[in-house]
């Protein structure tokens, strides 16, 4: 019978030509009277075998990732009969696997949108790489991930490649930022190869900013034939989140006389200061009263940043406007 | 790293003038606005002036105003801040300091969050 | 032109909460920032915002403003939190600082 050990050749061997192992027959006395033939795929380009011995040789570089297992028959001849003196049998070279792979990150380019003061833990994203390299074999294409940069704002997991949020981070300060993950084989170990990736990471807007005035103080005038109804003047308040987000609703907090209002215009933002009584400049020439601005919609968990409405003083002066003689007979 | 670091200060007469600079590095400058305030020697911060990101707007403190400008120039990552008509009141420690927000936020809401070593200014006779 | 005002030192134990104050007119509908100064150093962002922290900065320190009155608390007060605080707010296009708190934290 046939007499041989499982074949193995190592992946991107240098060597011109590499022993790989030996096929003989049981019934080889070694005297040179038997003939060894290889057949198959690869039969004298890839591996030769030595017809006396039965050594075979790899004398081609292989790669395990462009083929991991050649299929080969053998033969064995009497030289003096010319017959078989074993069946025709078949067997497999493997071919060993070396880290000559790095990890490749496939689903680039990464980009995620996380909200804007997110609390720690939470999950961003997920990053993959593969590593061509036998994942059976030893430690080559087992993974490590991590941070080149990114810190203090993001983690990841090791094993995992899951990004996490690691600080709070706010939006007004800064809108992007660029995460960059490295995976490593071996399991980080001397040695390993490496691939790495850069993850681009938005923060998406919530209401953590509250309107405010621009100015502490203004100053408007109205005539005293103005009629009631007629806009006197616009103020003006400033809120750095962005969207509904930044939408506002200006009114009034004092204003004894009642004598005005203020209704906002939504599309410029603005607070429109109305006369709502006519005035009268003999009976009173100036006003002071205080306008407030609050956002339109603050969800519950957001109202720690929205604890007290800025409010804003309006001067109001009264101009004379010169009546028509009113004196009796 | 990100850093500001001024120079330019010194000893100068009352009345005299001194130019003081902001270099920044480590950061994109022509994003961000930037404030100088000032210390004088045992008192508190005092804030002189800023200037947006483009420098499309400077204001500044009312002790300063019509006597001390302050400009920028985006391609050199340098703030300035040209002091004339100095006066003994002047004499303290210049901190250039980053308003922290991105372009498009206005206000001072986020406070000032790289600063420089600061440069001292003398006003003397 | 706007005034905050600040109590001029504050001492406290170590391991215990030292509280600093910060009046100013109406402040609770402004934002107010704070910053820690050491001797001979430069001035470090610690609280903005009002109750918001810069990267780095331990939540030992928080903040907070209603009314007339902001505050900021430091728990578990330790020996390197001896130094100047300021708090800040912004006015009408201009910036304003109080005129400081010294935290004396005894030994």
């Known amino acids: 019978g046939w007499v041989w050990n499982q074949f193995f050749v190592p992946e991107e061997m240098n060597t011109t030509s590499h022993h790989i192992g030996q096929l003989r027959s049981d019934l080889d006395n070694g005297n040179n009277s038997f003939q060894y033939k290889l057949l198959g795929a690869g039969a004298g380009s890839t591996f030769i075998i030595d017809e006396r011995t039965g050594d075979i040789y790899a004398i081609q570089k292989l790669d395990r990732e462009e083929r991991s297992l050649y299929i080969l028959r053998a033969q064995v001849i009497d030289i003096a009969t010319g017959r078989a003196v074993e069946p025709e049998s078949e067997f497999v070279i493997k071919v060993s696997d070396i880290n000559d792979n790095e990890p490749k990150f496939l689903d680039e380019p990464y980009e995620a949108i996380v909200p804007e003061m997110s609390p720690e833990g939470t999950l961003v994203i997920q990053v993959t790489a593969s590593d061509a390299d036998d994942p059976s074999s030893g430690n080559n294409a087992r993974l490590l991930y991590s941070l080149l940069q990114g810190q203090p704002y993001f983690s990841v997991e090791p094993t995992t490649g899951v990004i996490r949020i690691s600080s709070k981070m706010d939006r007004e300060l800064q809108d992007e930022y660029w995460v960059i993950i490295q995976a490593k084989d071996m399991i980080g170990q001397p040695g390993a190869l490496s691939g790495t990736t850069s993850v681009l990471i938005k923060l998406s807007d919530v209401n953590d900013n509250k309107p405010i005035f621009k100015e502490s103080l203004y100053r408007l005038t109205v005539s005293e034939s103005a009629p009631t109804g007629t806009s006197i003047g616009t103020i003006m308040a400033y809120d750095n989140d962005i969207g509904e987000n930044a939408e506002m609703d200006y009114s009034i907090e004092e204003d004894d006389s009642q004598t005005f209002d203020i209704i906002t215009n939504h599309e410029t933002q603005e607070g429109i200061v109305i006369l709502k009584k006519k005035v009268d400049f003999e009976h009173q020439n100036h006003y002071g009263i205080r306008a407030k601005v609050k956002n339109h919609h603050v969800p519950e968990q957001l109202m720690k940043y929205h604890t007290e409405a800025s409010t804003t003083f309006i001067k109001i002066q009264v101009e004379d406007v010169d009546e028509p003689g009113g004196g009796g007979s | 790293q990100v850093q500001l670091v001024e120079s330019g200060g010194g000893v100068v007469q009352p009345g005299g003038s001194l130019r003081l600079s902001c270099a920044a590095s480590?950061?994109?400058?022509?994003?961000?606005?930037i404030h100088w305030v000032r210390q004088a020697p045992g008192k508190g911060l005092e804030w002189v002036a800023v200037i947006w990101y483009d420098g499309s707007n400077k204001y500044y403190a009312d002790s300063v105003k019509g006597r001390f400008t302050i400009s920028r120039d985006n391609s050199k990552n340098t703030l300035y801040l040209q002091m004339n008509s100095l006066r003994a009141e002047d004499s303290a420690v210049y901190y250039c300091?980053?308003?922290?927000?991105?372009?498009?936020?206005?206000?001072?809401?986020?406070?000032?969050?790289?600063w420089g070593q600061g440069t001292t200014v003398t006003v003397s006779s | 032109s706007y005034e905050l005002t600040q109590p001029p030192s504050v001492s406290v134990s170590p391991g215990q909460t030292a509280s600093i104050t910060c009046s100013g007119d109406r402040l609770g509908e402004k934002y107010v920032s704070w910053y820690q100064q050491k001797p001979g150093q430069s001035p470090i962002l610690v609280i903005y915002?009002?109750?918001k922290w810069p990267s780095g900065i331990p939540e030992r320190f928080s903040g907070s403003n209603s009314g007339n009155t902001a505050t900021l608390t430091i728990s578990g007060t330790q020996a390197m939190d001896e130094a100047d605080y300021y708090c800040q707010a912004w006015d009408s296009s201009t910036v304003v600082f109080g005129g400081g708190t010294k935290l004396t934290v005894l030994s």
């Open positions: 300091a980053r308003r922290a927000g991105i372009p498009g936020t206005t206000g001072y809401y986020y406070g000032m969050d790289v």
């Open positions: 480590g950061f994109t400058f022509s994003r961000y606005g």
């Open positions: 915002q009002d109750n």
